[in-house]
Interface confidence: medium
């Protein structure tokens, strides 16, 4: 919206002549039309797009014309519009002869024409005034104009419309461009956001003046940085309200269970190192020389037959020691000091010479084994055994010793810790390769569902306005998290609009 | 008044006598029309002949002209084309102020471009 | 350049009402003015004013015709149509020099 504005300056007519060169009689009592529309390569006709105005009569042939009101007219004339200023226009100013009072086009005679100028061109919004003069045959027109905004606008083209306030619609005044410049302590578009106190966290807290910080649900402190812990959580802490993370060696819903089971039940024997591994559960790294869960059982070194041609083998506390036979020596038995004369191939294994007949090598037949031919073939040499059993030689056959969780002749079956229903109120058991896992039904928890938990309050969706719930497990109850701009136990109201200021 | 068989590259000049309104109040133009086409404008001048204007495709070789005195509008066409035929009105070209919705075209003259 | 389409020909039955449309190919409409003219042109005399911006009746024109649009389409009305209504219907714009004229609409008795 804005206001084009034309001061009509001098205007001459010497002979007093009309545009027909008819003289005027006794003068030419001279008013103004002026028609302004949109721009035109060629001004032709059709209406005055953007306004017309006419004078009265402000002079008789030749006169100057005054800046203020003239015999009821206004100088400079108003032609006021209500669009954006295209920047460019087409201008027509007539001077025309008023024989009497009536100055309607059909009261006047049709040659009453003085003068018609017509000028175009690009005109931008601004304060200073163009001066133009247009000169006829007869008639001379000097001239000024320019386009400004009306009140309230701003802006190249005056589309800006801006009026300051300070209210809960906004807390601004306007910059000349037509932008608007918040009042301090406001943001936003409209400047109706408040500025929180410095440092008030963006998410947590919020607030309805400036300079202020108003925690959501679930989070304290002078900032609203500091999140609260689920309500008696008693060795634990949290990084999002209602939570309760457990400090090291403590479990359950509420951080209240030991889970440092080696410290309080020293379950490991033998000097082996105790591992904590979850709620009653732990870990034995035993000493070499021993095995089993506990580290309980002792193992023989002698076991894995170390002593080589017939020696036997004698365990000690620190290891054990090869009793070799007659002929051999060394840790293990391994050196001979008998040659081929000396028939040392046992079960009909066949002699040979080595090194000049230093040295011997025992050919063994089928089912034997050893430097001398001296051993059965140990059928677990090939680890039959799956999942970790225990290969034992017995006479002619073997069989293998299964670890727990495992049966069959290899120990290939795995049995099913699932079998025995280990999961409590109705939970569904899998078997996994090291143990079996519970899944249990709403409202219970635990490794075996054994714990019974709240319902969870949130799954009826009950906070508004995109906020966030979560449930409170020692009430059965929800807390819903705000987002900015709503209050309420269930985020239904809008945050309460600041009081409005007089301007 | 002026129309007629022409050659191309010739020249021919067209006159409009108007009657019956001040002529020297109202802008004028020259509009032609052919069967193929159709109307076209092709001319304007200023109520006081300071200002004229053309379609691009005449330019430079017509002039638009006027004598308030005689209340007369011209045509003056040179180097004449084929495309030139066509019949040509004279209208006045106003409406500011003076009653809008009233125009006076000329009955039309036939101009016709031909070896 | 505006330009301004019209279908060729209508085939009207006298006493009926007769709709002719012209659609332009920019907006003709400016300050909430309609810059369109509607013509008549009876075969071998010049074309005679009929509406001017959109819906203004000319002067000494029947009732019968009307106009109305806005923008880019328009559409002159003759409602009943006689016998001396059998013409050439042009629309012309005035929104932007060089004026333009539609391609023209024929008139004819079914």
């Known amino acids: 919206s804005g206001v084009f504005q034309l001061q009509l300056q001098e205007f001459i007519n010497e002979r007093g002549v009309l545009a027909s060169g008819r003289p005027c009689e006794p003068g030419c009592r001279t008013f103004f039309r002026v028609c302004l529309k949109h721009f035109q390569a060629v001004v032709s006709p059709g209406p005055c797009t953007f306004g017309t105005v006419s004078t009265p009569v402000l002079g008789t042939n030749s006169f100057a014309v005054r800046d203020d009101s003239s015999g009821g007219g206004r100088n400079p004339l108003q032609l006021p519009f209500n669009f954006t200023w295209p920047g460019t226009f087409s201008l027509i100013i007539e001077a025309w002869h008023a024989p009497g009072d009536d100055l309607r086009p059909e009261a006047l005679p049709p040659d009453a024409l003085i003068s018609k100028i017509a000028i175009q061109g690009s005109l931008a919004v601004g304060q200073n005034w163009l001066l133009d003069e247009q000169t006829s045959t007869l008639t001379r027109l000097r001239y000024s104009y320019r386009v400004i905004c009306s009140d309230n606008y701003y802006g190249d083209n005056c589309s800006r419309l801006c009026k300051k306030r300070n209210d809960h619609f906004g807390h601004y005044v306007c910059q000349p461009d037509g932008n608007l410049s918040c009042l301090p302590g406001w943001t936003g578009e409209y400047c109706q956001q408040p500025i929180c106190l410095s440092g008030c966290h963006e998410q947590n807290g919020y607030c309805s003046k400036p300079a202020e910080c108003l925690c959501r649900p679930g989070w304290q402190g002078r900032l609203c940085n500091e999140c609260i812990p689920h309500n008696g959580c008693r060795h634990g802490t949290c990084s999002t309200p209602w939570q309760c993370t457990c400090d090291e060696g403590w479990g359950g819903l509420f951080c209240d269970q030991d889970l440092n089971y080696c410290t309080h039940h020293s379950p490991c024997k033998n000097g082996a190192t105790c591992s904590n591994s979850g709620q009653r559960s732990y870990t034995c790294t035993c000493r070499p020389g021993y095995t089993g869960v506990d580290c309980e059982l002792e193992l023989s070194e002698c076991d894995s037959n170390p002593c080589r041609n017939g020696g036997s083998c004698k365990d000690q506390e620190d290891g054990y020691h090869c009793l070799c036979p007659p002929g051999y020596y060394g840790l293990h038995c391994e050196h001979s000091t008998l040659s081929c004369a000396d028939s040392p191939c046992f079960n009909g294994g066949s002699c040979r010479e080595r090194n000049q007949g230093a040295n011997y090598a025992c050919e063994c037949p089928p089912n034997f084994t050893g430097s001398n031919c001296e051993k059965k073939v140990d059928r677990c040499t090939s680890n039959p055994c799956a999942n970790g059993g225990q290969c034992l030689n017995r006479g002619p056959s073997r069989m293998c010793r299964c670890r727990p969780g495992f049966t069959g002749t290899y120990c290939e079956l795995h049995v099913s810790d699932c079998a025995r229903n280990p999961c409590a109120h109705g939970g569904t058991c899998h078997d996994l390769e090291n143990g079996l896992m519970c899944t249990c039904p709403a409202g219970f928890s635990g490794r075996r569902c054994e714990v019974r938990t709240s319902i969870d309050a949130c799954a009826s969706s009950p906070c508004f306005n995109r906020a966030t719930c979560y449930t409170d497990l020692s009430t059965d109850t929800f807390v819903c998290n705000c987002p900015y701009g709503f209050v309420g136990s269930r985020c239904e109201f809008p945050v309460g609009l600041p009081p409005s200021f007089p301007w | 008044s002026g129309g007629g068989l022409v050659q191309p590259g010739r020249s021919m000049k067209l006159s409009c006598a108007a009657s019956?309104?001040?002529?020297?109040?109202?802008?004028m133009a020259w509009v032609r029309q052919d069967p193929k086409k159709g109307l076209e404008w092709v001319a304007t001048?200023?109520?006081?002949?300071?200002?004229?204007y053309y379609r691009d495709s005449v330019k430079g070789r017509f002039t638009i002209s006027r004598d308030n005195a005689k209340s007369t509008l011209y045509l003056q066409m040179d180097s004449l084309r084929s495309e030139d035929t066509a019949t040509y009105y004279c209208?006045?070209?106003?409406?500011?102020?003076?009653?809008?919705?009233?125009?006076?075209w000329g009955q039309g003259i036939s101009v016709t471009v031909s070896s | 350049d505006i330009v301004l389409t019209q279908s060729p020909a209508l085939a009207v039955t006298l006493g009926q009402r007769a709709t002719i449309s012209c659609r332009a190919s920019?907006?003709?409409?400016?300050?909430?003015?309609?810059?369109m003219q509607w013509y008549q042109q009876r075969p071998g005399r010049q074309p005679k004013l009929l509406i001017y911006?959109?819906?203004n009746l000319a002067s000494g024109i029947p009732a019968r015709f009307s106009g109305s649009g806005s923008g880019t389409d328009f559409t002159l009305t003759i409602d009943p149509v006689q016998a001396d209504d059998i013409a050439t219907y042009y629309c012309?714009?005035?929104?932007?020099?060089?004026?333009?004229f539609g391609g023209g609409t024929k008139l004819e008795l079914r």
């Open positions: 019956g309104f001040t002529f020297s109040n109202y802008d």
């Open positions: 920019q907006s003709v409409t400016i300050s909430n003015y309609n810059l």
């Open positions: 911006d959109a819906s």
């Open positions: 209208k006045d070209y106003d409406g500011h102020y003076h009653p809008y919705g009233m125009e006076a």
């Open positions: 012309q714009q005035s929104r932007d020099d060089p004026r333009t």
């Open positions: 001048i200023s109520y006081d002949g300071r200002s004229t």
